[in-house]
């Protein structure tokens, strides 16, 4: 499930690449649409750059 977050954006690193896995616990892209508006990826989980890394290995 993806939820929208406050507007703060930052990291872009690796994790979503495991595309045959499902990440039920991911809380992190900062937008609930496919494009960002004005904020940053502000992951409530505190996971670094979670707005860019959407799947856990």
């Amino acid at each position: 499930p993806i939820s929208a977050f406050a507007v703060d954006i930052p990291e872009t690193h690796g994790g979503e690449g495991y595309e045959d896995e499902i990440d039920d616990e991911y809380e992190g892209d900062w937008s609930n649409s496919s494009s960002s508006t004005s904020g940053a990826g502000d992951p409530s989980s505190g996971k670094e750059k979670s707005w860019l890394y959407t799947l856990d290995p």
Epitope: E11, T12, G17, W51
Partner: antibody, heavy 120, light 112 residues
Framework: EVQLVESGGDLVKPGGSLKLSCAAS????????MSWVRQTPEKRLEWVAS????????YYPDNVKGRFTISRDSAKKSLYLQMSHLKSEDTAMYYC?????????????WGTGTTVTVSS | DVLMTQTPLSLPVSLGDQASISCRSS???????????LEWYLQKPGQSPKLLIY???NRFSGVPDRFSGSGSGTDFTLKISRVEAEDLGVYYC?????????FGGGTKLEIK
């Protein structure tokens, strides 16, 4: 060796469209977020777009939002930038960049760039 | 948008000297997750930019230890302890804490 090779730059008229491509090699492409960064003729660097590792999420600054679309094809290890409604201020060298990972730097590898010129 | 202001615009140095470049952000760039995504890049003549420092003070792989980054909040500094010929070029700071991500205008390190 990690390599990024851009292609597709050209001279295009204002209002026109162009698609840039970036071929990646030397790393597990699907594990990393990717971005496009451009450098204007005045040598200013501007972030253009970013895409999450799996391609589900994309991010843009307001000045290109709605005109540019970043996408990726993991099978082809390629990154793309579809540009439409081009303006003279989009004239720049466009660099494909690799993200360093969740705890590292944003642009840890850069391609050599491809030149886009928007002029009538 | 977060405005990144670098000073000086040009920095003439003698080889072996220490060099210091300042970068100031128009607002705090501490991300809500606690990290400060402040980075430094070097673009040598005729080349693409290269990452030097990430998260304020972490040297990227292969970057010599004569490069060091420091600062917090809105004020950041890149120091080169002993300038070598290969260090010449344009240095850019970058913030990745708030969208849109933004770069400073650049500081040209050149021989005095």
């Amino acid at each position: 060796e990690v390599q990024l090779v851009e292609s597709g730059g050209d001279l295009v008229k204002p209002g026109g469209s162009l698609k840039l491509s970036c071929a990646a090699s030397g790393f597990t492409f699907s594990n990393y977020a990717m971005s496009w960064v451009r450098q204007t003729p005045e040598k200013r660097l501007e972030w253009v777009a970013s895409i999450s590792d799996g391609g589900s999420y994309t991010y843009y600054p307001d000045n290109v939002k709605g005109r540019f679309t970043i996408s990726r094809d993991s099978a082809k290890k390629s990154l793309y930038l579809q540009m439409s409604h081009l303006k003279s201020e989009d004239t720049a060298m466009y660099y494909c960049t690799k993200d360093g990972g969740p705890r590292e730097g944003y642009f840890d590898v850069w391609g050599t760039g491809t030149t886009v010129t928007v002029s009538s | 948008d977060v405005l990144m202001t670098q000073t000086p615009l040009s920095l003439p140095v003698s080889l072996g000297d220490q060099a210091s470049i300042s970068c100031r952000s128009s607002q705090s760039i501490v991300h809500s997750n606690g990290n400060t995504y402040l980075e430094w890049y070097l673009q040598k003549p005729g080349q693409s930019p290269k990452l030097l420092i990430y998260k304020v003070s972490n040297r990227f792989s292969g970057v010599p230890d004569r490069f060091s980054g420091s600062g917090s909040g809105t004020d950041f500094t890149l120091k080169i302890s002993r300038v070598e010929a290969e260090d010449l070029g344009v240095y850019y700071c970058f913030q990745g804490s708030h969208v849109p991500y933004t770069f400073g205008g650049g500081t040209k390190l050149e021989i005095k």
